[in-house]
């Protein structure tokens, strides 16, 4: 019996507007009705929590109002979008999935998505 598998893409390039989207998919060992998804950022062996949301299966993912993340869920798949990214935010973004209810609790961690963010070049001053 294998541990809960969490899959996510290896690499994602953020858009010029600093938006990156990726899918986090998990193979559930149980029939979870409440799931918690956390995005962690690992850079220079420092780990920080980017955002987290708990959702009921079949319902929308709700992040805090001031969160830089938004997302939707479909079955055992979560579509995550991170906004407001800048070049300094380049790093490994790890999807952590916790099956909260009903018991038992299960924990799964993805291998991480390397998000590359390139700051857009400033527009040159116009002579006209």
């Amino acid at each position: 019996c294998k541990a809960m598998h969490v899959a996510q893409p290896a690499v994602v390039l953020a858009s010029s507007r600093g938006i990156a989207s990726f899918v986090c998919e998990y193979a559930s060992p149980g029939k979870a009705t409440e799931v918690r998804v956390t995005v962690l950022r690992q850079a220079d062996s420092q780990v920080t929590e980017v955002c987290a949301a708990t959702y009921m299966m079949g319902n929308e993912l709700t992040f805090l109002d001031d969160s830089i993340c938004t997302g939707t869920s479909s079955g055992n798949q979560v579509n995550l979008t991170i906004q407001g990214l800048r070049a300094m935010d380049t790093g490994l973004y790890i999807c952590k999935v916790e099956l909260m209810y009903p018991p038992p609790y299960y924990l799964g961690i993805g291998n991480g998505t390397q998000i590359y963010v390139i700051d857009p070049e400033p527009c040159p001053d116009s002579d006209f």
């Epitope: 541990a3 962690l40 790890i94 924990l107």
Partner: antibody, heavy 120, light 107 residues
Framework: QVQLVESGGGVVQPGRSLRLSCAAS????????MHWVRQAPGKGLEWVAV????????YYADSVKGRFTISRDNSKNTLYLQMNSLRAEDTAVYYC?????????????WGQGTLVTVSS | DIQMTQSPSSLSASVGGRVTITCRAS??????LNWYQHELGKAPKLLIY???SLQSGVPSRFSGSGSGTDFTLTISSLQPEDFATYYC?????????FGPGTKVDIK
């Protein structure tokens, strides 16, 4: 510094109740999951229960399910274990422990324990 | 429930000796495994978390390895203060079970 201090242990008769407390200090209590772990005389460590940081999610060992209730008061920085219908096999030193970790959870701080003896 | 087994259940070793304790889970727990040291009458102490990460303040003679179902705790050079009982614990799924323990005493 982080401190966890258990209290409420003592001698109790089978079938009776007892409430353990764990007073926490030195950290933001409301940000951490908290656990109870016990050790019966001459035996190993046994995980008893966990309560998530916000108190919404609780899980129990099969041996205490339906008899023990874990709770917390974040305004008082205190963790509780309500133990009902106590049995002789519940005799143990009870520890509270803080759960930390980004990827997974581990118990980085423990109290010194409080002894519960169930005997007639 | 996930069962955790440890071997040996006890061992005698000399100061300066190398000690290896193994822990096996009844099913895969990825790397969600911790090691604790427990001396009688004291609070248990976290040594290793996430199978191989050394807890802050723990001497580097302690190391952990493994993933899936098989894990190892190694003490490279046993010191007098290391004589205690060692427990592995999984935090992949509730109940967060401990192994039965390995008692390390002086040869």
């Amino acid at each position: 510094q982080v401190q966890l201090v258990e209290s409420g242990g003592g001698v109790v008769q089978p079938g009776r109740s007892l409430r353990l407390s764990c007073a926490a200090s030195g950290f933001t209590f409301s940000s951490y999951g908290m656990h109870w772990v016990r050790q019966a005389p001459g035996k190993g460590l046994e995980w008893v229960a966990v309560i998530w940081y916000d108190g919404r999610n609780k899980y129990y060992a099969d041996s205490v399910k339906g008899r023990f209730t874990i709770s917390r008061d974040n305004s008082k920085n205190t963790l509780y274990l309500q133990m009902n219908s106590l049995r002789a096999e519940d005799t143990a030193v009870y520890y509270c422990a803080r759960a930390s970790g980004s990827y997974s959870y581990y118990f980085d701080y423990w109290g010194q324990g409080t002894l519960v003896t169930v005997s007639s | 429930d996930i069962q955790m087994t440890q071997s040996p259940s006890s061992l005698s070793a000399s100061v300066g000796g190398r000690v290896t304790i193994t822990c096996r889970a009844s099913q895969s727990i990825s790397s969600f495994l911790n090691w604790y040291q427990h001396e009688l009458g004291k609070a248990p102490k976290l040594l290793i978390y996430g199978a191989s990460s050394l807890q802050s303040g723990v001497p580097s003679r302690f190391s952990g390895s493994g993933s899936g179902t098989d894990f190892t705790l190694t003490i490279s050079s046993l010191q007098p203060e290391d004589f205690a009982t060692y427990y592995c614990q999984q935090t992949y799924s509730t109940p967060f079970t401990f192994g039965p323990g390995t008692k390390v005493d002086i040869k």
